[in-house]
Structure formats: structure tokens, C-alpha cells
């Protein structure tokens, strides 16, 4: 064996944005025949030796941070990739319009602004299919999302959460969905 | 309430073998990870092994690696260290210590300790 | 050699605050793990003082506090007492061979 053994994989299924009190599975996968897993939480200094962590109902406390690792003999693998577990449903939702509108001809310009009664610094939009969201830390209780040149990849169904820096897993309920229309 | 007690300590020669025992009760000893930690004479602590619940999770610090086992006996609430080959430098207390748990979760921090045995190894 | 470090020694007169720091590095520390604080009384076990940067079991006075930031950590101890005397350990994890390590340890002594 020379080096380390590889990292395994860590994912939240059906997904890493999990509203409260709904199931969640995070499965560490590393190659065939490992002899130990390690799934590790991390800022808590919690553990378990299991390759799979069930959580039947989201809580607060478990948002954040997650890492997993295998053993096979006396060799510990790199660690996985971070997977960061967001509790959505903590706070009331954001509202998110789009200005001018949310029609919008393809080359022109559109920006989508996500507005929150809450005292929050941190906003995430999501497009409907796409794995990741786009952040983007704002003042004055709102963010904007400027589109600029929309072709027709930008339309689809967009939804967007509020949160604090100072707790960046505990989410907003998402925003009414909001569709973006691209015509010409 | 939770004890732990080592035993089987005392004076080995160079390359000598010892086996240490660790008597747990107040607890349910299967539920848990336990360490084996050391502090040479006037020096500080040095974790040495740490054993899973069930006995299959084992690791070693790398002074002691294929030089000492650890096991355990959940049914007599045992847990144990044998050491082989040893060394001057294996003089110390051996503590064994309990790791935090909580619901499904084990914590990388020692809640209980034992009081120690002494290992002497000098010729 | 340790892999946390920590000063050998610190002193303080009765009724003062002292401080203790343990640095880490990247792969323990900084990677995540929480630090830990035990006492060790003169011819005792350690018995655990602060878990998980900043917490108190059960029984330990709130003269005692603990801290976190990066790849260090402090303890801190306010109203210094004459039963304070010990050695101190702070205690993290390792990512790298998942191994768990201590600071060198800290000798307090209390002046007068």
C-alpha cells in the first residue's frame, strides 16, 4: 500500500436541505470490503463507527458539519469531502420577486431579490434542478440576484432561504416558488 | 455509580510481556469505546489504544503498534492490554478511561478514569 | 514531544485569573475536533474539567471556563484558590491516523 487510501464519499439523501421534523439518511461509501467506517460530526466531537446515519426526524442540534473516514487494517483513509447538513424550516419563509418581472426576453436583464422581515445576513437561491444554490451574503434584510444577458437555461422554478452567519444550518422555510419565464 | 479499576501492573524486564486488566461496573461496559492512557513518572498523558463496544474497533498510538492488543470481555466487564516486548520507555501508569456517550453517538473526550496501575520496566 | 502545546508552567496569587493555551495544528484542532481541559490534583487521576471547548460537568465550579478559536484553545480560570493547584491537559483528536492526542501539560501554581 503506498499512500493514503482514497476518500470515500459522503451524501444526504434525498438531500442536504432537510426541513424539520423530515427524514434524512447521510451514507459514507468507500471501496468493497472496508473494515470500519467513521462518521464524524464535526464541532461536536461526536462519532459513530457506522457507514450510514438514519435521522427519522430533523432536529436543530443536528445541522452542521459532517465528515466520514474508513479503516481497512491499521490505515485510515483521507477524510470525505465536508457535507454540510442545513435544517430548513427554522425561521418563517422569505419572500422573492423579480424585477422588472419575471418575464423577462432572452438577452435581457433580470434581477430576482430575496426580501425577509428577519434581521438575516445570509441568502441562498435555488433553481429547481440544480445541485448547488447560489449564496449570497447581503445587509438590510434583503439580497439581490442580478441575471444579466437571461438566456433560455436561466427559466425554471426558483425558491430562496434566509439564515444568519452566526448559525449558517438553521434555514428559513423556502420562499414561494417563483417562475422565471424566458421568452424570444 | 461508575467505576473503573486497573490492575496487574508491576516490574517487567526489557522484553518482558504484562497484561493489564480494567474491572468496569456502574455501567453498561458493551456501550462503550475505553481507552488505555499512559503518564510516564513526572511526564504527561499519552493515549496508547482505544477499543469499540463490541470489541472489532481497535487503534493503537504508533509507539505501541504490533508491540501491544487490546481487548475487552463485555460479559465480565473487562477490558485489557497486553503488552509485549517492552520497553524502558513503557514505564508509566496506565490508566483506563471511559469515552462519552450519548444516544447513538460516542464523544472523543474520557467522562471516568481509572486510578492507575504502575508498570515498572527496568532489568 | 506532544502534539499539542501547551506552557510548561503558570502561576498566579489567590483571587487572580490565569490562562493556559493549547495549540494545535490543521489535522486536529483546526480540522474540526473540539478541545477538552482535564485537572490532574498531586497524586490523582485527571478528572475531566471542560469538554467540548467551553462545557462544565456537573460539579466543576464556573471559575473555570474554556475556549476555542482556529487552531488553538484556552482555559481560563478566574478567582484563583489554593485548591487549583495542578497539572492541567487539554486533549483534541486527529484526523490523520484518527488518533487521540494530549497537550504536554501545564503545572499551576498558586502564589502565597
Known amino acids: 500500500q503506498s499512500g493514503p487510501l482514497p476518500k470515500p464519499s459522503l451524501q444526504a439523501l434525498p438531500s442536504s436541505l432537510v426541513p424539520l421534523e423530515k427524514p434524512v439518511t447521510l451514507r459514507c461509501q468507500g471501496p468493497p470490503g472496508v473494515d470500519l467506517y467513521r462518521l464524524e460530526k464535526l464541532s461536536s466531537s461526536r462519532y459513530q463507527d457506522q457507514a450510514v446515519l438514519f435521522i427519522p426526524a430533523m432536529k436543530r442540534s443536528l445541522a452542521g458539519r459532517y465528515r466520514c473516514s474508513y479503516q481497512n487494517g491499521s490505515l485510515w483513509s483521507l477524510p470525505s469531502d465536508q457535507l454540510e447538513l442545513v435544517a430548513t424550516g427554522v425561521f418563517a419563509k422569505p419572500s422573492l420577486s423579480a424585477q422588472p418581472g419575471p418575464a423577462v426576453s432572452s438577452g435581457g436583464d433580470v434581477t430576482l431579490q430575496c426580501q425577509t422581515r428577519y434581521g438575516f445576513d445570509q441568502f441562498a437561491l435555488y433553481k429547481e434542478g440544480d445541485p448547488a444554490p447560489y449564496k449570497n451574503p447581503e445587509r438590510w434584510y434583503r439580497a439581490s440576484f442580478p441575471i444579466i444577458t437571461v438566456t433560455a437555461a436561466h427559466s425554471g422554478t426558483y425558491r430562496c432561504y434566509s439564515f444568519s452567519s452566526r448559525d449558517p444550518y438553521l434555514w428559513s422555510a423556502p420562499s414561494d416558488p417563483l417562475e422565471l419565464v424566458v421568452t424570444g | 455509580q461508575v467505576q473503573l479499576v486497573e490492575s496487574g501492573g508491576g516490574l517487567v524486564k526489557p522484553g518482558g510481556s504484562l497484561r493489564l486488566s480494567c474491572a468496569a461496573s456502574?455501567?453498561?461496559?458493551?456501550?462503550?469505546?475505553v481507552s488505555w492512557i499512559r503518564q510516564a513518572p513526572g511526564k504527561g498523558l499519552e493515549w496508547v489504544s482505544a477499543i469499540g463496544g463490541s470489541g472489532s474497533a481497535v487503534q493503537y498510538a504508533e509507539s505501541v503498534k504490533g508491540r501491544f492488543t487490546i481487548s475487552r470481555d463485555n460479559a465480565k466487564n473487562s477490558l485489557y492490554l497486553q503488552m509485549n516486548s517492552l520497553r524502558a520507555e513503557d514505564t508509566a501508569v496506565y490508566y483506563c478511561a471511559r469515552h462519552y456517550r450519548e444516544f447513538r453517538w460516542h464523544y472523543y473526550y474520557f467522562d471516568y478514569w481509572g486510578q492507575g496501575t504502575l508498570v515498572t520496566v527496568s532489568s | 514531544q506532544s502534539v499539542l502545546t501547551q506552557p510548561p508552567s503558570v502561576s498566579g496569587a489567590p483571587g487572580q485569573r490565569v490562562t493556559i493555551s493549547c495549540t494545535g495544528s490543521s489535522s486536529n484542532i483546526g480540522a474540526g475536533y473540539d478541545v477538552h481541559w482535564y485537572q490532574q490534583l498531586p497524586g490523582t487521576a485527571p478528572k475531566l474539567l471542560i469538554y467540548g471547548n467551553s462545557n462544565r460537568p456537573s460539579g466543576v465550579p464556573d471559575r473555570f471556563s474554556g475556549s476555542k478559536s482556529g487552531t488553538s484553545a484556552s482555559l481560563a480560570i478566574t478567582g484563583l484558590q489554593a485548591e487549583d493547584e495542578a497539572d492541567y491537559y487539554c486533549q483534541s483528536h486527529d484526523l490523520g491516523a484518527h488518533v487521540w492526542v494530549f497537550g504536554g501539560g501545564t503545572k499551576l501554581t498558586v502564589l502565597g
Open positions: 456502574g455501567f453498561s461496559f458493551g456501550d462503550y469505546y
